[in-house]
């Protein structure tokens, strides 16, 4: 927890971030929190990055005032407004990029005092894996596929019934680029698999960890996918 | 290549309401924001309002507030404008237009157009 | 809401001259953080749709001729055409996104 120090004579207000991870592409939130104040009139909330010379978002007198945001921000980002006054500054971030990576500041300024933390934001690509089995092989064989990774991950597999187990051998994981350029396609094939065995395909990198199971017996095929977040810390 | 298609001319009776279409291609319609752009015969270019596809999330101006209502069809890549209680002043050509991408906003100048659409509001 | 005014409404000049036409905004459109003014220019040639020339007031956008050259900040702009070509036959407005977007009455320039 960092608590930010009131300056000119103002008492300091506790201001919470967590770190945590967009999706390039998609929208990404970017959560701050702080002791309300009653009156939503005296409440400022400006979210900076560093390296970048605009504001992020500036929300004062109860709206938006964009008039100083950066460019690459433009059209972008939202707070939430109806929740302002319950002490939510989080920032809602349309169209998540690369380039938004980075350190961002919520700085909060109400009638009790001003306070700032710092929020460590990573940006990639992650999905779930789906885990089938590949009736066009000539062995029993399993296909993992994620449409969306950046960083490339690694893909390691596991089974039930043989854990410890080195896979490597008999897999093939091929990384194919996405039209986009950025993001990659993720497709690992498992060879020689056995009836009546649970298989997991684990993707990872950095950002996130995901994994996708698949418990195939004669009679049936059962499947499962979760995905973690690898960096949600608290400041 | 970035296309914006719209549909075809409009002849409408006054009170009445249309429903104008811009169809994209060429690029992820859902994070980019659409614009629309109203042009009188002879006259010069007015910014209506625009919409983002990925939320359905919307801008107006003061003045066609209530009177065009945007929304987005994300699975067809196509942006819609209904003008309501149609008067004569509202005879025009309407334009999509789409922002160029700077480091993933697309609030910013229209490096691209649709032909426009005529609409003629006439007893 | 934020005003743009353009002047002279209309002009006409020989090829190969140069011109300018001025924007004038109701109030600042400078981010003073960034530095940049949020004007831009746009040509509409007869029947056509418009095509931007010039965004953040001075830089050109790819493709658009080193003939057209924007500057200004703040409040007043101006686009220049270093020298007319006939197919510069257009009108041309100017745009304001410091607050959501507003365009200019434009300045329709004809070619003697």
């Known amino acids: 927890l960092i608590i930010g120090f009131g300056i000119s004579g103002r008492h300091s207000i506790t201001v919470t971030t967590v770190a945590s991870a967009g999706n390039i592409g998609e929208d990404g939130i970017l959560s701050c929190t702080f002791e309300p104040d009653i009156k939503l009139s005296d409440i400022v909330i400006q979210w900076l990055k560093e390296g970048v010379l605009g504001l992020v978002h500036e929300f004062k007198e109860g709206k938006d005032e964009l008039s100083e945001q950066d460019e690459m921000f433009r059209g972008r980002t939202a707070v939430f407004a109806d929740q302002v006054i319950v002490g939510n500054a989080s920032l809602r971030l349309k169209n998540v990029q690369l380039t938004d990576a980075g350190t961002y500041k919520c700085y909060i300024i109400t009638s009790k005092g001003k306070g700032n933390a710092n929020l460590e934001y990573k940006t990639g690509a992650f999905s779930m894996p789906e885990v089938n089995v590949d009736y066009n092989a000539s062995s029993e064989t399993l296909r993992c596929e994620a449409p969306r990774w950046f960083p490339q991950p690694t893909v390691v597999w596991a089974s039930q019934v043989d854990q410890g187990a080195n896979f490597s051998e008999v897999s093939n994981t091929s990384f194919e680029l996405n039209s986009e350029n950025v993001t990659m396609k993720v497709v690992s094939v498992l060879y020689n698999v056995t009836i009546n065995n649970t298989y997991s395909c684990m993707i990872e990198n950095d950002i996130a960890k995901a994994t996708g199971d698949i418990k195939v017996t004669e009679s049936e095929i059962k499947r499962r996918s979760h995905l973690q977040l690898l960096n949600s810390k608290a400041s | 290549q970035v296309q914006l298609q719209q549909s075809g001319a409009e002849l409408a009776r006054p009170g009445a309401s249309v429903k104008l279409s811009c169809k994209a291609s060429?690029?992820?319609?859902?994070?980019?924001?659409m614009q629309w752009v109203k042009q009188r015969p002879g006259q010069g270019l007015e910014w209506i309002g625009a919409?983002?596809?990925?939320?359905?999330?919307?801008r107006y101006t003061q003045k066609f507030k209530g009177k065009a209502t945007l929304t987005a069809d994300k699975s067809s890549s196509t942006a819609y404008m209904q003008l309501s209680s149609l008067a004569s002043e509202d005879s025009a050509v309407y334009y999509c237009?789409?922002?160029?991408?700077?480091?993933?906003?697309?609030?910013?100048?229209?490096?691209?157009w649709g032909q426009g659409t005529l609409v003629t509001v006439s007893a | 809401d934020i005003v743009m005014s353009q002047s002279p409404s209309s002009l006409a000049v020989s090829a190969g001259e140069k011109v300018t036409m001025s924007c004038k905004s109701s109030?600042?459109?400078?981010?003073?953080?960034?530095?940049?003014?949020?004007l831009a220019w746009y040509q509409q040639k007869p029947g056509q749709s418009p095509k931007v020339l010039i965004y953040w007031a001075s830089s050109r956008e790819s493709g658009v001729p080193d003939r057209f050259t924007g500057s200004g900040s703040g409040t007043d702009f101006t686009l220049t055409i270093s020298s007319v070509q006939p197919e510069d036959l257009a009108v041309y407005y100017c745009?304001?996104?410091?607050?959501?977007?507003?365009f200019g009455g434009g300045t329709k320039l004809e070619i003697k």
């Open positions: 060429g690029y992820t319609f859902t994070t980019y924001w």
């Open positions: 237009a789409r922002g160029r991408d700077y480091s993933g906003s697309s609030w910013t100048w229209f490096a691209y």
């Open positions: 109030q600042s459109l400078l981010n003073s953080r960034t530095r940049k003014s949020y």
């Open positions: 745009k304001q996104s410091y607050n959501l977007y507003t």
């Open positions: 919409i983002y596809p990925g939320d359905g999330d919307t």
